[in-house]
Interface confidence: low
């Protein structure tokens, strides 16, 4: 006959480990007893349990309440045991010794491997701003046994660097994702992916990128200067920009206060029926926490009663 066991039994922390030991005997052979012991090198063999065909299961005090026989139906030639609630300290070598009649004794060893699934954490880097060089976007750390794998899943171009710290029974892996911030990255997901044999599926933590920027400002509304004539209704100027965080807008007149009747509505400056009093230099001031931009335009309101035509100047400044 021979013993059937596994070279390695792998179990996740806190779960029950089945330590297999099955005697494949010839017809008529019987198993008298099965002894299980911890057999790590450098330590004396530590008894776990004794399964006796007549007297049943005896568990040594150190493993009281933790070692059981698998539930029935059980084959009398099966000496497998269940080690309840595996902890990291249970990792190591185990020996199964089977006493049979009439064939004698057999022994086999297996290694119990206790997987400690990681609990990953993701830490965003410093605030990202357009114009920075290579900057840390986020770091992701996971500790487990064996060492977990930490990778990144994203459409964003960047570079990764990993480092690992070994502890007595586990390893921590940290991976950093660096990028050159640009406005196109705004709202893009950056996902840390942690793989480990103790996980049924990869763990994923997603961070949404926020890159601060402020686009150049420009003013629309003066494209056709002939529309800006005395008496025209509904004339307006609109300030165009975009940013993250979203910018606020402020309108001023460079050569004096805003004329009476001129309305400021966020990015839009609305005029009452035009008079020559509305001629002047108007400035749109755009700002967010990251930066500020200015754009100015010169408005010339044409008076049909005057022969001389006037020019419209458009100036943009940062």
């Amino acid at each position: 006959g021979e013993l059937e066991t596994s070279d390695v039994v792998t179990v996740v922390l806190g779960q029950d480990a089945k330590l297999p030991c099955f005697y494949r005997g010839d017809s008529g052979e019987q198993v008298g007893q099965v002894a299980w012991a911890r057999a790590d090198a450098g330590e004396g063999a530590q008894e776990l349990a004794l399964l006796h065909s007549k007297y049943g299961l005896h568990v040594s005090p150190a493993y009281e309440g933790r070692v059981e026989q698998p539930p029935p139906p059980r084959n009398p030639l099966d000496g497998s045991v269940l080690l309840r609630n595996a902890v990291q300290a249970d990792e190591g070598e185990y020996e199964c010794r089977v006493s049979t009649f009439p064939a004698g004794s057999f022994q086999a060893r297996l290694r119990l491997r206790v997987l400690v699934p990681p609990l990953p954490s993701l830490n965003p880097g410093p605030a990202l701003e357009e114009g920075q060089g290579l900057t840390l976007a986020a770091s992701c750390t996971a500790e487990g046994s064996p060492a977990p794998s930490v990778t990144w899943d994203t459409e964003v171009k960047g570079t990764t660097s990993s480092r690992s710290f070994k502890h007595s029974r586990s390893a921590a892996v940290t991976s950093e994702f660096h990028l050159v911030p640009s406005r196109s990255m705004n709202g893009q997901p950056l996902t840390c992916v942690v793989s480990h044999p103790g996980l049924l599926q990869d763990q994923r933590i997603t961070h949404i990128l926020h890159v601060s920027f402020l686009a150049e400002a420009s003013v629309r509304g003066l494209e056709d200067q002939n529309l800006w004539h005395v008496g025209r209704e509904g004339a307006m100027l609109k300030c165009l920009s975009e940013g993250q965080p979203p910018p606020s807008y402020n309108w001023t007149r460079l050569d004096g206060p805003l004329p009476s009747g001129v309305r400021v509505d966020g990015d839009t400056l609305g005029f009452p029926p035009l008079t020559t009093e509305h001629s002047g230099i108007y400035v749109c001031h755009v700002s967010n926490e990251f930066s500020s931009r200015d754009s100015q335009v010169t408005v010339d309101v044409l008076d049909p009663q005057e022969d001389s035509g006037k020019q419209v100047d458009l100036v943009s400044a940062s």
Epitope: D16, K18, S27, P71, P73, N75, P76, D78, L82
Partner: antibody
């Protein structure tokens, strides 16, 4: 090769008993468990109980206790399942299966039992 | 009793598709789970045991995984002959219980 051959179909009246046989060949009969499992028409599988012919130990599903008896004859390598006090809901195909040591690896072809007045 | 809940109850897929059937136990059953295939009018046949071990003669397109309460049977490339009902079963504690079955249909 391992084979489990079951007895033929049965038609029974409510309140009667039925005894289904399962003849094993191709392996050492006394070294493996024999389980009995049933399947009502269009339904799933329901475990009834097992016997270990080596020492004639048995275990039954509580749902059938008192109505089912599983036996084995080592001289003919045959296991039996007897179900008494039959009712219409016992109409099913009854299977025997070998287990080694926890998993049902080979099954009989099934025996149809119909309970009808 | 330990309940075994299978999903989906019916699955329609095409030849060559990757198919996954899941089984959830109402409490931990370690890896003491078997999967069976039953073709119309036939007895069940063992496919996988101890969750991830393929039984003798089972094609390697069948694979199993899981531990504790959640288990999966996967067919990597569906063949026409795989039309059947698939059952999971826990062998951890009596009464041994089966999932309600997943009927696999070929599109």
């Amino acid at each position: 090769q391992v084979q489990l051959v079951q007895s033929g179909s049965e038609l029974k009246k409510p309140g009667a008993s039925v005894k289904v046989s399962c003849k094993a060949s191709g392996y050492t009969f006394t070294s493996y468990y024999i389980h009995w499992v049933r399947q009502a028409p269009g339904q799933g599988l329901e475990w009834i109980g097992w016997i270990y012919p080596g020492n004639v130990n048995t275990k039954y599903n509580e749902r059938f206790k008192g109505r089912v008896t599983i036996t084995a004859d080592k001289s003919t390598n045959t296991a039996y399942m007897e179900l008494s006090s039959l009712r219409s809901e016992d109409t099913a195909v009854y299977y025997c299966a070998r287990s080694n040591p926890y998993v049902m690896d080979y099954w009989g072809q099934g025996t149809s039992v119909t309970v009808s007045s | 009793d330990i309940q075994m809940t299978q999903s989906p109850s019916t699955l329609s897929a095409s030849v060559g598709d990757r198919v996954t059937i899941t089984c959830r136990a109402s409490q931990s059953v370690n890896n003491d789970v078997a999967w069976y295939q039953q073709k119309p009018g036939k007895a069940p046949k063992l496919l996988m045991y101890y969750a991830s071990n393929r039984f003798t003669g089972v094609p390697d397109r069948f694979s199993g995984s899981g531990y504790g309460t959640d288990f999966t049977l996967t067919i990597s490339s569906l063949q026409a002959e795989d039309l059947a009902i698939y059952f999971c079963q826990q062998a951890y504690r009596s009464p041994y219980t089966f999932g309600q079955g997943t009927k696999l249909e070929i599109k």
